[in-house]
Structures are given as C-alpha cells and as structure tokens.
C-alpha cells in the first residue's frame, strides 16, 4: 500500500471577504492524478463534488467551485478533500468565507477574475479561449 496522500490546499478568489451579490471561486488543489475533488461545509452535511480537474502546475491538479452571487448563507467554513486511485485524502485546512460589505469606494466594484484562468494564467487553459460565457457559474442555491 502506498503512503499517505498529500493533504489538499484550499483558497478563494478574489479573496475570503466577499460583498453580498458578488462572485467567489473556491479553489482546491492536490497532486496530479486526482479523480475527484469534494468541497465540504464545516459540518460535512453539505458538499459539492467535481471531476472537472485541471492542472495548476506540473505537480498539482486543481478544481474550482464557483458561486455566482454570494449571500449570508454562503458564509462559513469550507474544506476540501479528494479521491485518488479510490483512496480519500485527508481534509485541507478550513477556509473561512466572510460575506460582508467592504469599506472603500463603492463605485469601484470588486474585480471578477476569469474563472478558467484565475489571477495567473495556468497552462492547461492556455488555448486563447474566447468562448467561455461571462457568468454562468454554479449559483449559490445549487451549491448548498
């Protein structure tokens, strides 16, 4: 039997503090060869699975969980885990998603990252794609 699977990591784009109505993408990362990622809420009672895995680097794969329009109900603690070769990994650390109005110039909306490229372009998505619709991600009510 192989050794323990590497622990996944979790992050959020554009950040963990999101104004109501704005989008957020939670990103889970693990090793190459992950078959499925799972994003869980704190109590494990609600989760979302995906097999839409892409490469984050030569040694990492990732999955992205998008919420188009966050509400107070989306606030809370999230963590990731994954399946590789029929084995489940450990959980990632918790990510605390905060939904609140941010201070500052209200005429400057939070910038929305490209959900397939993120803040830095990843080679798996380097096909100069112009065909991705602007905002058809998973809505909050479908996610949880």
């Amino acid at each position: 039997q192989e050794g323990p699977l590497p622990r996944p990591s979790i992050s959020a784009e554009p950040g963990t503090v999101i104004p109501p109505g704005r989008p957020v993408t939670i990103v889970c990362r693990g090793p190459v060869g992950v078959d499925q990622f799972r994003l869980e809420r704190e109590d494990r009672s609600k989760f979302n699975d995906t097999k839409d895995v892409s490469q984050a680097s030569p040694s990492e794969s990732e999955a992205r969980f998008r919420i188009d329009s966050v509400s107070e109900g989306n606030a809370g603690h999230y963590r990731c885990l994954y399946v590789k070769s029929t084995r489940w990994s450990e959980h990632s650390d918790y990510l605390d998603l905060v939904v609140k109005e941010t201070s500052g110039d209200t005429d400057s909306p939070v910038t929305e990252p490209d959900s397939s490229a993120g803040p830095t372009q990843r080679p798996s998505d380097n096909s100069h794609n112009e065909h991705a619709p602007a905002s058809q991600g998973l809505s909050a009510e479908h996610l949880y």
Epitope: V32, D49, K51, S116, Q136, G137
Partner: antibody, heavy 117, light 107 residues
C-alpha cells in the same frame, strides 16, 4: 456502466455542416469535463475540443485546426455533448470520439464523418 | 503547442517479451501524461494516467514511468491480446497533443 454513444456522422460536401451528438449515461455527466477526439482513416489521434463544467463557466478550448469552425457545447439536463461542425473540409474526414475528461478514461464507439464532393 | 514524440513507430515482439515504448515531450509536463491502447476498428482504451497510475481494470503487466519530458510505457510480459497500437498524450496544456503511435506486431 459508463456509456458514451455518438451519433450524427455521415457524408457531407466541403463547406457543409454537421452536428454530432454524444449521449452519456452511467455517470454524473454535469461534474465532468468532456472532449471530442478524432482519427482520420489510417492516422493517429487528434484532440479536437474540450468543454468544462458549469463551475468553470462552461469554458471551451479548441485545436487550431478547427477553431472558428467547430463549436463544442453541452446540455446537462439531457446528459448530452455536442459538436457543431461548420465550413467542413476534406481533411475533417475522420471518426469522431466523445471522451470523458480529464483523464480520457471513457470513450464512445465513434461516428464517421466523411467530407467529400 | 507541446509536441509529443513517440518511439519506436512500430516494433515486432513475441509473446512473453518485455516491451518498452517511450514518449518525449517538447517541454516539461510534470506527470500530466496518459497512455492508451487501440485495436483496429475500436476506440482507444486508457491504460495509464498521471504518468504512473494504472487505470481501472488494466492488467498489472502494464506500467508507466517518467516525469518532466521523458516517459515510458512498459509491458512486462507481452500477451496475445496486447498486440495493438499504443499512444501517449499530454494533458498539461491545450491542445492536448498525442504521440504518433507505436504499433506492436507479432514477430
């Protein structure tokens, strides 16, 4: 049992159009990225297009050889993948396979597209 | 685009032989590599993904190794049903390019 069944192939003249369909069953279609791969007679494999899931804005990617002529799409409510092929050329003649991503682990049986005058 | 160079393009071997096929990527792809087997008139079948992981239902005589730019598919003891064409494919970046194929024939 995972099944991918392609349809819509046939004989078409250069410049014509065809729409391929792939009916998926036996797995949760809407959480999987999907691909089209083709194989010209007696030749090797060529990746054609990829479509991601709703979580990824249904982002699409194409081989340069088909960009601006082919469009990949999906209908998750029908568990169906599509490939709309316009401005077809003789070099598009091939067997077209529907393939589950990201590791190309399940393939359909293929549908033959022949472009000839 | 990443080019995948597969060698040899064909080989003749006997049942029981150890067979090695190599694939060279034009730039580093980590372990984002898959190997497929295709028999005439049939769809390809996934053998190896993530360079070294055996796909479901694939016999253990098949193994994959390598990372970065150099990869190998090994069949430890060739069986009659293994005579086929084998392809590598990089899954690191689109377009997801395939190698040219290796036809394994009966000696």
């Amino acid at each position: 049992e995972v099944q991918l069944v392609e349809s819509g192939g046939g004989l078409v003249k250069p410049g014509g159009s065809l729409r391929l369909s792939c009916a998926a069953s036996g797995f949760t279609f809407n959480i999987n990225a999907m691909n089209w791969v083709r194989q010209a007679p007696g030749k090797g494999l060529e990746w054609v297009a990829r479509i991601r899931t709703k979580n990824n804005n249904f982002a699409t990617y194409y081989a340069d050889s088909v960009k601006d002529r082919f469009t990949i799409s999906r209908d998750d409510s029908k568990n169906t993948l599509y490939l709309q092929m316009n401005s077809l050329k003789t070099e598009d003649t091939a067997v077209y396979y529907c393939v589950r991503g990201p590791y190309f682990d399940y393939w359909g049986q293929g549908t033959l597209v022949t472009v000839s005058s | 685009d990443i080019q995948m160079t597969q060698s040899p393009s064909s080989l003749s071997a006997s049942v029981g032989d150890r067979v090695t096929i190599t694939c060279l990527a034009s730039q580093t792809i980590g372990t984002w590599l898959a190997w497929y087997q295709q028999k005439p008139g049939k769809a390809p079948k996934l053998l190896i993904y993530a360079a070294t992981s055996l796909a479901d239902g694939v016999p253990s005589r098949f193994s994959g190794s390598g990372s970065g730019t150099d990869f190998t598919l090994t069949i430890s003891s060739l069986q009659p049903e293994d005579f086929a064409t084998y392809y590598c494919q990089q899954l690191y970046s689109t377009p997801y390019t395939f190698g040219g194929g290796t036809k394994v024939e009966i000696k």
